[in-house]
């Protein structure tokens, strides 16, 4: 049986997710991110809450965080643009755009991911891919290589049940099943990819992982298309 990796997942195929980014603070992995344009990485706003004094960088082209790889490159951040409505105490609007110090060098292992612009819910039960370097077990073990898991989308009504997230899931958020397979701490800011398209970003609120009554929460990128476009313009 799977031994964690994300939670309940496995090691990803190396460099098969060329859009995948590691947002780093003082040289250590902090959050996931996704390359959405040559010079822009999308992540979660809460990731930078405690990063005021540290150096934020973005690692692209990586599979292993520690091993040398020809495609790996660490980029400085020119500017960080959190969504203007994001707040420390809510999961709403939990998006962050990071402008790299220069355009990323694109290649087979570094390439932006198309993101969903049609503001329509993903059908429940659709299997979506989540990847990250987040913890792989409840003891908090961090992987060196990228992990991934396929998760079914959960309908909003179920996710909003009193026993689950009790009405907190707005139309700008979506949920995925969390029954032993789940995204977890350190995966925040990473991509939820459905049918090869970016549909969601892992929110960075504190949440118990792998408990089916507490589904994973993801920010729907299509709901923020106007904001993303305005920042990237």
């Amino acid at each position: 049986p799977p031994r964690g990796r994300i939670l309940g997942g496995r090691e990803a195929e190396a460099h098969a997710r060329p859009y995948m980014a590691s947002v780093q603070l003082n040289g250590a992995h902090l959050c996931g991110g996704v390359l959405v344009a040559e010079q822009w990485v999308l992540s979660a706003a809460h990731c930078l809450e405690d990063a005021a004094d540290g150096k934020v960088q973005v690692l692209l082209g990586a599979h292993s965080l520690s091993q040398p790889e020809p495609s790996k490159r660490l980029y400085d951040v020119l500017r960080a643009v959190p969504h203007p409505d994001s707040q420390p105490d809510t999961i709403d609007h939990d998006l962050l755009l990071l402008q790299l110090s220069e355009k990323a060098t694109l290649g087979p292992a570094v390439r932006p991911l198309p993101w969903q612009r049609v503001d329509r819910d993903v059908a429940p039960g659709t299997l979506c891919d989540v990847a990250g370097w987040g913890i792989v077990n409840h003891a908090g073990r961090r992987p060196d290589s990228l992990q991934h898991v396929l998760l079914p989308v959960l309908d909003r009504a179920t996710c909003n049940r009193r026993t689950h997230h009790d009405g907190a899931i707005t139309e700008r958020l979506m949920c995925a099943e969390s029954n032993r397979r789940d995204s977890c701490k350190g995966d925040s800011g990473g991509p939820l990819v459905c049918g090869g398209v970016l549909e969601g970003v892992v929110t960075s609120g504190s949440r118990v992982c792998g408990n089916r009554k507490k589904p994973g929460i993801y920010t729907r990128v299509a709901s923020y298309a106007a904001w993303i476009d305005s920042v990237l313009a």
């Epitope: 990803a12 997710r17 659709t126 891919d129 397979r181 049918g195």
Partner: antibody
Framework: EVQLQQSGPELVKPGASVKISCKAS????????MHWVKQSHGNILDWIGY????????SYNQKFKGKATLTVDKSSSTAYMEIRSLTSEDSAVYYC??????????????WGTGTTVTVSS | QIVLSQSPAILSASPGEKVTMTCRAS?????MHWYQQKPGSSPKPWIY???NLASGVPARFSGSGSGTSHFLTISRLEAEDAATYFC?????????FGGGTKLEIK
């Protein structure tokens, strides 16, 4: 390479139920979703649903809700599909299929051998 | 649900010819998968995510397309290519297949 071995052909009477099996050849059975697909006469392929052997989470095509039930036995690395209230419309070849890769572009890279179900009085 | 329509239903061509079959979706699909099936056998993965050849698939096959129109092309037809080809979308549950294109060799 992983193989999915399905149970043999079934001849069943209308109104009855049938349970067909799909056994994975390797021991990483719980790591991968198991899907079921119906191929009826005229070669039409219909996705029935999937089950996650790791946690029992399943999803069905609305068309097959109440008709098919998916289960697994982790100890024998076997997935099952039960089809109830059989009619001639259920006569078909049924396949289990899975994705054993780890890229984000999942597809059915492994298919079972197929089980022919014939409904006839 | 997303409906996939394949055309032509039957395609007859001679060895060495270039052939293209089409899969049209009722709504936009970013990536399409294709499977090959020969009589009496299970379907085989053939092209995944629109343009990637599955393991063991000859380089004369290619896939292309975006949105609602996707294509499978064989640059130089060979006798062993006779089969039925199905497209499949995986963007949205329920996952759906096209009705198939039966490729016959003259």
């Amino acid at each position: 390479e992983v193989q999915l071995q399905q149970s043999g052909p079934e001849l069943v009477k209308p109104g009855a139920s049938v349970k067909i099996s799909c056994k994975a050849s390797d021991n990483s059975f719980t790591g991968y979703y198991m899907h079921w697909v119906k191929q009826s006469h005229g070669n039409i392929l219909d996705w029935i649903g999937y089950i996650d052997p790791y946690n029992g989470v399943s999803s069905y095509n609305q068309k097959f809700k109440g008709k098919a039930t998916l289960t697994v036995d982790k100890s024998s690395s076997t997935a099952y599909m039960e089809i109830r209230s059989l009619t001639s419309e259920d006569s078909a070849v049924y396949y289990c299929a899975s994705y054993y890769g780890s890229s984000p572009y999942w597809y059915f890279d492994v298919w079972g051998t197929g089980t022919t179900v014939t409904v006839s009085s | 649900q997303i409906v996939l329509s394949q055309s032509p239903a039957i395609l007859s061509a001679s060895p060495g010819e270039k052939v293209t079959m089409t899969c049209r979706a009722s709504s936009s699909v970013s990536y399409m998968h294709w499977y090959q099936q020969k009589p009496g056998s299970s379907p085989k993965p053939w092209i995944y995510a629109t343009s990637n050849l599955a393991s063991g698939v000859p380089a004369r096959f290619s896939g292309s397309g975006s949105g609602t129109s996707h294509f499978l092309t064989i640059s130089r037809l060979e006798a062993e290519d006779a089969a039925t080809y199905f497209c499949q979308q995986w963007s949205s549950n329920p996952y759906t297949f096209g009705g198939g294109t039966k490729l016959e060799i003259k």
